[in-house]
C-alpha cells in the first residue's frame, strides 16, 4: 500500500543546518542567507516498523537522489551512512531495517532513533562543520534534537 511522504530540511537544536560533505556524508554547520540553499532536502517517508507508543517509523532519503540514511555496523560500532539504492525499488513501505528511524516528536523537537540499533540516534557535534553521525548517548554533549522545516516546491 502506498504511504505518505514529505519534503523537509532538518536543523539541530543549535540551528545548525545539514549539508553534503562529499558524496556519502552529511555535516552540520550554521548557514545564513543564500547559503541556506546548500541545505540537504530530505524526502521523509512513513514506513513499516515495530510498534511503540510515541515512535513513528520513517525513512530519510535525499530528495531526487537515490541515497538514503542507513545504519550499519562498521568496526563493531553502529554507524550512520548514506547508502545508494535502486531508484526503481525505493521508497517502499517495507524498508530494510537499516533504513528505518523511529521518529520521536515532542514539543516540535524531533529525535531519530535507529530501528536497527535501539538507543542510537542521529546526532551532531557541538562543533561546527563536523559530520552527522549515529550517537549512543542522549542528553550529553552531542545533539540529538532537531527541528523540521517543510520545503515548498
Amino acid at each position: 500500500a502506498p504511504v505518505r511522504s514529505l519534503n523537509c530540511t532538518l536543523r539541530d537544536s543549535q540551528q545548525k543546518s545539514l549539508v553534503m560533505s562529499g558524496p556519502y556524508e552529511l555535516k552540520a554547520l550554521h548557514l545564513q542567507g543564500q547559503d541556506m540553499e546548500q541545505q540537504v532536502v530530505f524526502s521523509m517517508s512513513f514506513v513499516q516498523g515495530e510498534e511503540s507508543n510515541d515512535k513513528i517509523p520513517v525513512a530519510l532519503g535525499l530528495k531526487e537522489k537515490n541515497l538514503y540514511l542507513s545504519c550499519v555496523l562498521k568496526d563493531d560500532k553502529p554507524t550512520l551512512q548514506l547508502e545508494s539504492v535502486d531508484p526503481k525499488n525505493y521508497p517502499k513501505k517495507k524498508m530494510e531495517k537499516r533504513f528505518v528511524f523511529n521518529k520521536i516528536e515532542i514539543n516540535n523537537k524531533l529525535e531519530f532513533e535507529s530501528a536497527q540499533f535501539p538507543n542510537w540516534y542521529i546526532s551532531t557535534s557541538q562543533a561546527e562543520n563536523m559530520p552527522v553521525f549515529l550517537g549512543g548517548t542522549k542528553g550529553g554533549q552531542d545533539i540529538t534534537d532537531f527541528t523540521m522545516q517543510f520545503v515548498s516546491s
Epitope: 500500500a1 511522504s5 514529505l6 516540535n108 515548498s152
Partner: antibody
C-alpha cells in the same frame, strides 16, 4: 491560546465553487501537517485530505480532482478549494492538525464551518 | 481503501456501567488506530491513539486495546459527561484515512 478557526462556509449552488480557510493562532502552521475532515448533517466523520509541504498533499479518493488543499505560511492559513460542488458535499468542514508528523491522528480541531450546496 | 466498521451503532447504558465499543478494520493496520469523542455541535476530541495510548487530559476510565484488525474502546465506569458519539479511525502514514460510522452512546 492555541486554536484553529475555519471560515468561508455558506450557501452555494450545485456546480459552484467555494474556498474555505483555516487560520491558526497561538502556533505556527508552517511546519504542521493540516487535514480537512467533513461531517454531513446527522452523519459521521469523513476524511477529505492532508497537506505537508505544498508539494505533498494526499486526498480521499472521492475528493481527488474536485478538492485542493493549499497553504499560505505567511498568513498562517490553510485552504480547501472545492469545485463542482454537489448536494452531497453539504457538511460541516473541520480543519485539524496532525498530532505528530505521520501519526495520522488529530489532536487539535477547529470549530467547523458549514457548507450548504443547494439551488 | 481501508473500511472501518464499528459496533454497535447505538448503545444505551447507565452511569457507572462498563461499556465496550468495537472497531474492525478491513485489513491489518497494526496498532495505528485512534478513538474520538464527539458531542452535538462540537468538534471531535482525540481520546486514544496508537490503539491504547491515552491522549493528553483524557480520564483514565477510558482505555483502548487491540491490534491488526480488531480493536476495542472501553469506558470502565460511565460518567454523565461520557454520553456522546464515538468514532474509530485508522491512523499512521498510509495514504488513506477512514473513520468508522460512529457509535452513539445514550442514557438507558
Amino acid at each position: 491560546e492555541v486554536q484553529l478557526v475555519e471560515s468561508g462556509g455558506g450557501n452555494v449552488q450545485p456546480g459552484g465553487s467555494l474556498r474555505l480557510s483555516c487560520t491558526a493562532s497561538g502556533f505556527s502552521l508552517s511546519n504542521s501537517a493540516m487535514a480537512w475532515v467533513r461531517q454531513a448533517p446527522g452523519k459521521g466523520l469523513e476524511w477529505v485530505g492532508i497537506i505537508y509541504d505544498s508539494a505533498s498533499t494526499y486526498y480521499a479518493s472521492w475528493a481527488k480532482g474536485r478538492f485542493t488543499i493549499s497553504r499560505d505560511n505567511s498568513k498562517n492559513t490553510v485552504y480547501l478549494q472545492m469545485n463542482s460542488l454537489r448536494a452531497e458535499d453539504t457538511a460541516t468542514y473541520y480543519c485539524a492538525r496532525e498530532r505528530a508528523i505521520f501519526s495520522g491522528d488529530f489532536a487539535l480541531w477547529g470549530q467547523g464551518t458549514l457548507v450548504t450546496v443547494s439551488s | 481503501e481501508i473500511v472501518m466498521t464499528q459496533s454497535p451503532s447505538t448503545l444505551s447504558a447507565s452511569v457507572g456501567d462498563r461499556v465496550t465499543i468495537t472497531c474492525q478494520a478491513s485489513q491489518s493496520i497494526s496498532s495505528w488506530l485512534s478513538w474520538y469523542q464527539q458531542k452535538p455541535g462540537k468538534a471531535p476530541k482525540l481520546l486514544i491513539y496508537k490503539a491504547s495510548t491515552l491522549a493528553s487530559g483524557v480520564p483514565s476510565r477510558f482505555s483502548g486495546s487491540g491490534s491488526g484488525t480488531e480493536f476495542t474502546l472501553t469506558i470502565s465506569s460511565l460518567q454523565p459527561d461520557d454520553f456522546a458519539t464515538y468514532y474509530c479511525q485508522n491512523a499512521g502514514g498510509g495514504v488513506s484515512i477512514a473513520f468508522g460510522q460512529g457509535t452513539k452512546l445514550t442514557v438507558l
